[in-house]
Interface confidence: medium
């Protein structure tokens, strides 16, 4: 015998209460499956979540993060702070930049500074947290028209710093 | 030299017990990334089986590991253990010990900079 | 979780271009917690890519990786003699605990 709720389509469930009747989900629930006994309550967005994708009678709601925030887990379960410049994100959520390293972006790792003396160069503004050194000029840049900034060396890995 | 040796495989009947090491040189263990440990069945791929964080001591497993594994540390030896209980035949594989990379402020960034050569472990009767 | 990498193997020549793709079941924290590894018989994996596109420290430029959330690709701009291997990758997720998952691996073989 084939089971009479099978035949309820998605948006609906099998309303024991009404001889298995398939009745529509409530308000603010959903089933997005054919054949159910009962509709998911629809989940909210609340603080620091935003609704990405509002609740349908076949779909639950979708959240992302407010700005200042980034999403973490499956289906966003969760919203982290971004990490601010002069950061990188670990394990253990936002850390300052170790001295030498830098990232000048809200996102990714800190980089070691640009080693200014492998091109022969000199340091003319120092390091921080939140930026590379600029290299000042060799001997051979004193020439008319030469540019006296390096740009930044390739993104490598810092390297395991801690001992 | 910075190196990870693994030791403490060997044969083991099925539903006996192994404790395996892995030594750390060249770094020390006090910090807030992991130690852990990956397993590889012959002609397999890579499974991970569970870290410990070598700073506040939290451990991660695997589900099909909880239960039967155990990850333990011994930071003023810079060593780290795995204790295999209830051992399987499909439990036979080389077992690997690897560090978490850390950031330049030392803590875990998920990802594994350095492995030891291995250590096998067969179960079998 | 689950982690597929696709192909399972391939055999390709030196120079020519390989990609490998990996599909998580589960977006890896931060959309980019992803790392590649390169695996010779009887060795322990080596890393070659860490944060889904960055080159770890002495690996050729010819690798290279991209993606976020669920799916990421690894290149071979122009193989080489010595690329002849396993590669897998590996996700780091956070859900209720800190969980790491490795891909099912892609073998790459002479043609």
């Known amino acids: 015998l084939q089971d009479p709720c099978s035949n309820c389509p998605a948006g609906t469930f099998c309303d024991n209460n009404r001889n298995q009747i398939c009745s529509p989900c409530p308000p603010n629930s959903f089933s997005s499956a054919g054949g159910q006994r009962t509709c998911d309550i629809c989940r909210q967005c609340k603080g620091v979540f935003r609704t990405r994708k509002e609740c349908s009678s076949t779909s639950n709601a979708e959240c992302d993060c407010t700005p200042g925030f980034h999403c973490l887990g499956a289906g966003c379960s969760m919203c982290e702070q971004d990490c601010k410049q002069g950061q990188e994100l670990t394990k253990k959520g936002c850390k300052d930049c170790c001295f030498g390293t830098f990232n000048d972006q809200k996102r990714g790792i800190c980089r070691p500074w640009t080693n200014c003396s492998l091109d022969g160069k000199s340091v003319l503004v120092n390091g921080t947290k939140e930026r590379d050194v600029v290299c000042g000029p060799s001997p051979a840049d004193l020439s008319p028209g030469a540019s006296s900034v390096t740009p930044p060396a390739p993104a490598r890995e810092p390297g395991h710093s801690p001992q | 030299e910075v190196q990870l040796v693994e030791s403490g495989g060997g044969l083991v009947q099925p539903g006996g017990s192994l404790r395996l090491s892995c030594a750390a040189s060249g770094f020390s263990f006090n910090n807030d990334y992991d130690m852990c440990w990956v397993r590889q069945a012959p002609g397999k791929g890579l499974e991970w089986i569970g870290c410990i964080d070598t700073g506040d001591g939290s451990t991660y497993y695997a589900s099909w590991a909880k239960g039967r594994f155990t990850i333990s540390r011994d930071n003023s030896k810079n060593t780290v253990y795995l204790q295999m209980n209830s051992l399987r035949a499909e439990d036979t594989a080389v077992y690997y010990c690897a560090r978490e990379a850390a950031s330049s402020s030392g803590y875990g960034m998920g990802y594994f900079d350095l492995w030891g050569q291995g250590t096998l472990v067969t179960v079998s009767s | 979780i689950q982690m597929t990498q696709s192909p399972s193997s391939l055999s390709a020549s030196v120079g020519d271009r390989v990609t490998i793709t990996c599909q998580s079941s589960?977006?890896?924290?931060?959309?980019?917690?992803l790392a590649w590894y390169q695996q010779k018989p009887g060795k322990a994996p080596k890393l070659l890519i860490y944060?889904?596109?960055n080159l770890a420290s002495g690996v050729p430029s010819r690798f290279s990786g991209s993606g976020s959330g669920t799916d990421f690709t690894l290149t071979i701009s122009s193989l080489q003699p010595e690329d002849f291997a396993t590669y897998y990758c590996?996700?780091?997720?956070?859900?209720?605990?800190?969980?790491?998952?490795f891909g099912t691996g892609t073998k790459v073989t002479v043609l």
């Open positions: 944060r889904a596109s």
């Open positions: 589960q977006s890896v924290y931060d959309n980019n917690w």
């Open positions: 590996q996700g780091t997720y956070l859900s209720s605990n800190w969980y790491w998952a």
